[in-house]
Interface confidence: medium
């Protein structure tokens, strides 16, 4: 069901864009899942609007979201993650907007976290190493990780590495000597679920060593 | 009109191969998972194969699991069954079944009038 | 995959009376539990979701309750057309599988 408000207190409803975007989090806090969903338009008058998800839920044919402040969520267990949900925006009984989705195709997982850089002097690298709480998880346990790095002084400049486990390499001789470096991390999901990036991980910083003169290899 | 209309079925060898296809109608095919459901001569309702509206969820019954592939054609909104290596224990009438999520989890509110497979040398 | 026990397998019973099946889940399945009827020759056909919800179309004598693991299905007034197969089913979404029960033959006394 989707369209438009037609009675009198409605009537500006119509001139408003009520598209929206949400994600799916799931076994985010323990066995409970999420759904997070917010007007693309930040300008959007959400006084009187509500999200209902119906369809594809166990138990229960539909549910409300919570509003806060300018997102609509929910925390639940009652995702089927098999079939499309209609997420609808809501006057009162009134559907503004729907969208038909499959929670399992919107999937944001968790950012990742302890990122770490260790520096090996007798292998001339650094081991870059990283953990995420998908790897206790019974679904979204496969990801793809983007290493992201950059000289700090390169403010745009980034390097960007994929890898599927938490630990990666880099060569000393690939970056610059007496330098500081910042790092950080991001995951998707890589297998039976598709979705979004997650939230970037705190950036760790590191300093290469200087160049050993003699030698031409840094410190 | 929901209708489902299966074919293929037939009588074939054991050992022999077979493909079973569900013509679906009256309804959008590619927002439901869709299922086989099989019945013996006399006998009760047995679950084969179902799969998601996008082909990533798919599941089998551990008694056809490795010798049956279900697959589906969104654009064609047909639904098929694959069934390799069959045996005379396969032997039944088979059913495609539309799933209705929005009841609130795995239903299955239209069936089709069904096919007969018969396995036997 | 969860095992389902019907019973009884079978019953006879009168047109007018009040008839309940029941429905044993090996764990517990929360609500989520369907009864299906199937008269010989046709297709199954859906009476109650969710264990209790009645299906459009399907005469109010049918009822659903239970969950976790028991769940009864009861004809309040036995009617002819009613003499038939009934089947109770449950699901697991993850990965994707369906069990039915073992069926109750419900027939005329």
């Known amino acids: 069901e989707s369209g438009y408000a037609q009675n009198g207190d409605l009537e500006d409803a119509e001139l408003d864009d009520y598209s929206f975007s949400c994600y799916s989090q799931l076994e985010v806090n323990g066995s409970q899942h999420s759904l997070t969903c917010a007007f693309e338009d930040p300008d959007v008058n959400t006084t009187n609007l509500e999200f209902e998800i119906c369809g594809a839920l166990v138990e229960v044919k539909c549910l409300n979201f919570r509003k806060l402040q300018e997102i609509y969520f929910i925390e639940t267990k009652k995702f089927l993650l098999i079939g499309k949900s209609n997420i609808c925006v809501k006057v009162g009984e009134k559907s503004l907007t729907c969208k038909k989705i499959d929670l399992t195709t919107i999937v944001k997982p968790e950012a990742p976290f302890d990122l770490s850089v260790i520096y090996r002097e007798g292998a001339n690298d650094f081991v870059v190493t990283f953990n995420t709480s998908h790897l206790q998880k019974k679904y979204v346990k496969v990801l793809m990780h983007d290493v992201a790095y950059r000289q700090e002084k390169d403010e745009n400049k980034w390097t960007h590495v994929n890898l599927s486990s938490t630990k990666l390499t880099l060569l000393q001789r690939k970056l610059q000597p007496a330098a500081m470096y910042e790092i950080k991390v991001r995951s998707i999901p890589d297998h039976y679920f598709k979705g979004f990036w997650s939230e970037w991980s705190p950036s760790y910083y590191f300093r290469t060593p200087e160049i050993n003169n003699s030698s031409g290899e840094m410190d | 009109e929901v209708q489902l209309v299966e074919s293929g079925g037939g009588l074939v060898q054991p050992g022999r191969s077979l493909r079973l296809s569900c013509a679906a109608s009256?309804?959008?095919?590619?927002?439901?998972?869709m299922h086989w459901v099989r019945q013996a001569p006399g006998k009760g309702l047995e679950w084969v194969s179902g799969?998601?509206?996008?082909?990533?969820?798919?599941g089998y019954a551990d008694s056809v699991k490795g010798r049956f592939t279900i697959f589906r054609d969104n654009a064609k909104n047909s639904l098929y069954l694959q069934m390799n290596s069959l045996r005379a224990e396969d032997t039944a009438l088979y059913y495609c079944?539309?799933?209705?999520?929005?009841?609130?989890?795995?239903?299955?509110?239209?069936w089709g009038q069904g096919t007969t497979v018969t396995v036997s040398s | 995959a969860i095992q389902l026990t019907q019973s009884p397998s079978s019953l006879s019973a009168s047109v007018g009376d009040r008839v309940t099946i029941t429905c044993r889940a090996a764990?517990?399945?929360?609500?989520?539990l369907a009864w299906y009827q199937q008269k010989p020759g046709k297709a199954p056909k859906l009476l109650i979701y969710?264990?209790?919800s009645l299906e459009s179309g399907v005469p109010s004598r049918f009822s659903g309750s239970g969950s976790g693991t028991d769940f009864t299905l009861t004809i309040s007034s036995l009617q002819p057309e009613d003499f038939a197969t009934y089947y109770c089913?449950?699901?697991?979404?993850?990965?994707?599988?369906?069990?039915f029960g073992q069926g109750t033959r419900l027939e005329i006394k």
């Open positions: 079944a539309k799933d209705e999520y929005s009841r609130g989890y795995y239903v299955l509110d239209v």
């Open positions: 009256g309804f959008t095919f590619d927002d439901h998972a």
């Open positions: 799969i998601s509206w996008n082909s990533r969820g798919i």
């Open positions: 764990q517990g399945i929360s609500s989520a």
């Open positions: 969710d264990a209790s």
């Open positions: 089913q449950q699901f697991n979404s993850y990965p994707l599988w369906i069990t």
